[in-house]
Interface confidence: low
């Protein structure tokens, strides 16, 4: 007798590993024999699709090599024309051992930056990712975290983070390890020991000592008054990523010596500098013996302070006077960043006019020193506190690069404007008068040791030092 189809073994959920075989069974009782069709996610599976095998009159569907895209709902439908068609459905859950789809790669990074080592994984159940550094599991902390993606993020990379890393993906089906990758941490060049300034007698030997570190180990070059060192012997040694350079000099003239440590990070370089001055005791010769020439100031640092097209004295005891004097004022200028807003413009004016002295052209170009009164005004009024601190530090030897020894004049040795008004230079940028000064807050308990000159206001003043001063 004809009998409508009945599915005697309903489809069940099938778990299958990738690349393995998965079979659904749909046992049907009916007469006549039914026609059985299969669907995946409601799309008909074609009989000639070579990825599948359909046997036992359609009752067995086999996926020959499971792919992760085979996940879904599979249904069999049986129909023999007697009664209605019957259907049974079951799910295929594709299980997958962990697989690392984006492994970590070697990284070179500069200390202090953020490093991310990728480790993207696949797997079902979703694998958890951990990391191994060297032979030990890597522990997370406030800087080091394993992200949800599995990537390793290291904030503010430190030297000790350098090493060999691998990620480990694990689920209930197995474990996958990435290849070992290298994290290299590069460190900007840094000077550990700066050369010290010396005040020596003419013809003596001096050794300047400069120590630097970095990864890769930096190279050290020495600059004398803005140019590569032309004389003197250099000895170098490297130990534990520290380079030690000693420059031995025979002193015949004062100079500014700069130690420059440089290392390379990819296409870029990092440099660190430290400078020392070599001054010669009894070097302050009479002005007429000064060797130099007059030229227009072409630098940058003193642009706002010196008069436009000012004629300044360039000292040929330096190999490159413009460069050396500019470097000198630049270094001293940096030390002024910390002084009070009352002191700073006055000190800048004093510095620039002292290092780039006004020049009197003639058969023998002569530098014109600053008038004593202006120097004392800066020292005892505008910068009283700062001057005291600086002198104290000088006595105690606290200045590492004693630039100020060259940069700050000794007021008492300067000529007074009352002796010969043409023998010394005024500071046009200190636009003060006795009326203005009365309103200044007291800077020191002692009165200035000089009567501050009553000068007409300078029309070319870039800034005025008064209760309401400005600087351009």
């Amino acid at each position: 007798l004809p009998k409508a189809p009945v599915i005697t073994t309903p489809l069940e959920t099938v778990d299958a590993l990738v690349e393995e075989v998965a079979t659904f069974m749909c046992a049907v009782e009916s007469y006549p024999q039914p026609e059985i069709s299969w669907t995946r996610n409601k799309i008909l599976i074609k009989l000639f699709d070579t990825r599948y095998s359909i046997r036992e009159n359609g009752q067995l569907l086999t996926i020959l090599s499971v792919e992760d895209s085979d996940d879904g709902i599979y249904c069999c439908t049986a129909n023999n024309g007697v009664g209605g068609a019957v259907e049974s459905c079951g799910a295929l859950q594709v299980k997958m051992k962990p697989k690392i789809t984006r492994p970590p790669i070697n990284v070179k990074i500069i200390e202090g930056l953020k490093a991310v080592l990728p480790c993207t994984t696949m797997g079902n159940p979703k694998p958890s990712v951990s990391w191994i550094k060297g032979d030990s599991p890597l522990r997370e902390n406030s800087r080091i975290a394993v992200l949800e993606s599995g990537s390793l993020r290291i904030h503010n990379v430190q030297k000790e983070d350098a090493g060999q890393y691998r990620c480990v993906a694990k689920n209930s089906l197995g474990t996958a390890y990435s290849k070992v990758v290298k994290l290299e941490v590069e460190v900007f060049a840094r000077i550990l020991r700066a050369p010290e300034s010396h005040n020596v007698t003419f013809g003596s030997f001096v050794t300047l000592h400069c120590t630097a570190t970095g990864i890769p180990v930096p190279t050290i070059t020495w600059i004398e008054n803005g140019n590569a060192v032309s004389s003197g012997s250099i000895q170098e040694s490297v130990k534990d990523r520290v380079i030690d350079s000693r420059l031995q000099l025979f002193i015949t003239k004062p100079g500014l010596y700069t130690c420059i440590a440089t290392n390379k990070h990819g296409e870029k370089f990092s440099t660190a500098k430290a400078a020392a001055t070599i001054s010669i005791a009894e070097w302050s010769k009479p002005q007429k013996d000064n060797k130099g020439y007059c030229a227009q100031y072409r630098g940058e640092v003193c642009n706002a302070v010196l008069a436009k097209d000012a004629l300044v004295f360039l000292n040929t005891s330096y190999a490159d006077p413009e460069e050396a004097q500019e470097l000198l004022v630049h270094t001293a200028w940096n030390e002024l960043k910390v002084v009070s807003p009352v002191c700073r413009p006055a000190a800048e004016a004093l510095l620039c006019n002292h290092i780039f002295q006004e020049c009197s052209p003639g058969v023998v170009p002569t530098p014109i020193p600053i008038c004593r009164e202006y120097c004392l005004a800066v020292k005892e009024l505008f910068c009283a506190k700062e001057w005291l601190v600086m002198e104290e530090k000088t006595h105690r030897g606290l200045y590492r690069s004693e630039m100020h020894l060259l940069s700050v004049p000794e007021c008492s040795k300067l000529p007074s404007m009352h002796w010969d008004p043409t023998a010394c230079a005024r500071l046009p940028h200190l636009d003060y008068n006795k009326e203005n000064l009365k309103t200044f807050p007291p800077m020191t308990s002692s009165k200035p040791s000089v009567d501050i000159p009553n000068l007409p206001s300078s029309s070319s003043s870039s800034f005025s030092v008064s209760p309401t001063y400005s600087m351009t």
Epitope: K126, S128, S130, S136, P137, E140, V146, E148
Partner: antibody
Framework: ELQLVESGGGLVQPGGSLRLSCAAS????????MSWVRQAPGKGLEWVSA????????YYKESVKGRFTISRDNAKKTLYLQMNSLKSEDTAVYYC??????????????WGQGTLVTVSS | QTVVTQEPSLSVSPGGTVTLTCGLS?????????PDWYQQTPGQAPRALIY???SRHSGVPSRFSGSTSGNKAALTITGAQPEDEADYYC????????????FGGGTKLTVL
């Protein structure tokens, strides 16, 4: 305030089963690995099991492997320890502990007050 | 099997300094073992003190410090207080498997 509260302990016969729970509050539960640590009466601490933030893998002390199952439900902010085939040597206070990072590996920086499991006939 | 070793008991006077050590029955303790230290007072749950050799957990007083010296990890209490009387446990990772997180037997510290 960060809190870990264990429950589910009690008296059970050898060969029996228990399921311990640990309810977490005061922190982002699904950002941290978790662990179970036990302490037999009058004895020291003993690490038992660990699970990372996403539950994707599990770790067990060799002597409990195959008998204990650690799991977590991040939606419910709860950690579980299913203990089967219990032995008298499993008698201990069981502490739930939070790890210091996402993975199962890390210092145990917060602990619950513990729940006592007694295995005895 | 390698065992994590600690002094069974130590005592210190209030205000004094004491050092607890954590070693291995064979081999040396290094920073790769990530030594952790826990404090447990009677009837209470353990509390984290030091992790990864020398990092203090938040809220832990500065008198507690960690280090490795010689072939052991060490916990030093400088200026011990009566409330520091407790059991102290160190824990080490033994190799690259997370299952090898092993606690020492503990040190009972008495503040006399």
């Amino acid at each position: 305030e960060l809190q870990l509260v264990e429950s589910g302990g009690g008296l059970v016969q050898p060969g029996g089963s228990l399921r311990l729970s640990c309810a977490a509050s005061g922190f982002t539960f699904d950002d941290y690995g978790m662990s179970w640590v036990r302490q037999a009466p009058g004895k020291g601490l003993e690490w038992v099991s660990a699970i990372p933030w996403n539950g994707g893998s599990t770790y067990y002390k060799e002597s409990v492997k195959g008998r204990f199952t650690i799991s977590r439900d991040n939606a419910k902010k709860t950690l579980y320890l299913q203990m089967n085939s219990l032995k008298s040597e499993d008698t201990a206070v069981y502490y739930c502990a939070k790890r210091s990072g996402r993975i199962a590996f890390g210092a145990l920086d917060a602990w619950g007050q513990g729940t006592l499991v007694t295995v005895s006939s | 099997q390698t065992v994590v070793t600690q002094e069974p008991s130590l005592s210190v006077s209030p205000g004094g300094t004491v050092t607890l050590t954590c070693g291995l029955s064979s081999g040396s303790v290094t920073s790769s073992n990530y030594p952790d230290w826990y404090q447990q007072t009677p009837g209470q749950a353990p509390r984290a003190l030091i992790y990864s050799t020398n990092s203090r957990h938040s809220g832990v007083p500065s008198r507690f410090s960690g280090s490795t010296s010689g072939n052991k990890a060490a916990l030093t209490i400088t200026g011990a207080q009566p409330e520091d009387e407790a059991d102290y446990y160190c824990a080490l990772y033994m190799g690259s498997d997370i299952r090898n997180y092993v606690f020492g037997g503990g040190t009972k510290l008495t503040v006399l």
